[in-house]
Interface confidence: low
Amino acid sequence: GELETSDVVTVVLGQDAKLPCFYRGDSGEQVGQVAWARVDAGEGAQELALLHSKYGLHVSPAYEGRVEQPPPPRNPLDGSVLLRNAVQADEGEYECRVSTFPAGSFQARLRLRVLVPPLPSLNPGPALEEGQGLTLAASCTAEGSPAPSVTWDTEVKGTTSSRSFKHSRSAAVTSEFHLVPSRSMNGQPLTCVVSHPGLLQDQRITHILHVSFLAEASVRGLEDQNLWHIGREGAMLKCLSEGQPPPSYNWTRLDGPLPSGVRVDGDTLGFPPLTTEHSGIYVCHVSNEFSSRDSQVTVDVLDPQEDSGKQVDLVSAS
């Protein structure tokens, strides 16, 4: 007869490991007992369990509650056992020694491999601001056994770098994603992808990029200077900018206070029926936590009684 087993048994951490040992004997042969032991190199054999044809299963104290026979029906020639709830420390060499009648003793070895699936964590880098050079956007770390693979899935242009740290029973892999921040990256997903033989599918963690910026400011509303004449109703100036975080707007008049009746509504400055006292230099201030911008315009309210047209100057400053 001969023993049938596996060279390697692979399980995921926390799963039950079936350690196979089946005696394929000739007709009339019987298995008296099966002894299981752990036999790692450099250490003495440590008994797991003894499976006796008459007295049943005896489990050594070190494995109490963790070694069982497979559920019925059982073949009397099957000396396989279940090792419950495999942990990393169970990884190693195991031996089954089968005593048969009348053929004598047989033994076989197998290796138990315990996969530790990674539990990835994604850490965003420092705040991203337009104008920075190459900056860390995020780092992703995953530890497992064997070492996991850590990659990035994104449409954002960037560079990656990885490093690995070996521990006694596992390895930690950290991958960093660097980029040059630009406003077009705002809202773009950056996904860390972790692959491992102990995972049914890749694990993915997504980070949404936020890049602080503030666009140049400009003022609309003075495109046709002839519309800015005494008595006109509904005249308004609108300040144009964009930013992340969204900016706030403030209006002032450079050559004095805002005239009475002028309404400030966020990015818009609304005028009552125009009079000559509305002539002046108006400044739109745009700011967010990242930066601030100014844009100023000169308003000349025309008197239809006068023939000479007056010019409108637009100056933008930041």
């Epitope: 951490l13 926390g14 770390t141």
Partner: nanobody, 124 residues
């Protein structure tokens, strides 16, 4: 999004009992080792207990052995900490942790998943 939400913290007299619960969403807790840590005011965060993925294997800090019992209900994605014979020294914020590590005792806040914590106060 992964979330661990602890509940059950309270003010209790010395010698009393409490049961903490930790509900996990966004991941399959049954594949993870689950644990509890605690942090008393002015002290380092310390390991309390852990239960392995299948629920059969548990481990405790020496200071709580025999008084605390950790258990899990994989169907509900929940882990529990039954605390009996509470002492004033057990006063702390208790954190639920999910990980896969045999060395969960040495986990730091940058590793695994952590809850926000629940306050347990034991008065003498």
């Amino acid at each position: 999004e992964v979330q661990l939400v602890e509940s059950g913290g309270a003010l209790v007299q010395a010698g009393g009992s409490l049961r903490l619960s930790c509900s996990v969403s966004g991941l399959t807790a049954s594949r993870l080792t689950m644990g509890w840590f605690r942090q008393a005011p002015g002290k380092e965060r310390e390991f309390v207990a852990r239960v392995y993925a299948s629920g059969g294997l548990t481990d405790y800090a020496d200071s709580v052995k025999g008084r605390f019992t950790i258990s899990r209900d994989n169907a509900k994605n929940t882990v529990y900490l039954q605390m009996n014979s509470l002492e004033p020294e057990d006063t702390a914020v208790y954190y639920c942790v999910a990980g896969l590590w045999a060395d969960m005792r040495t986990m730091t806040s940058t590793r695994g998943y952590w809850g926000q914590g629940t306050q347990v106060t034991v008065s003498s």
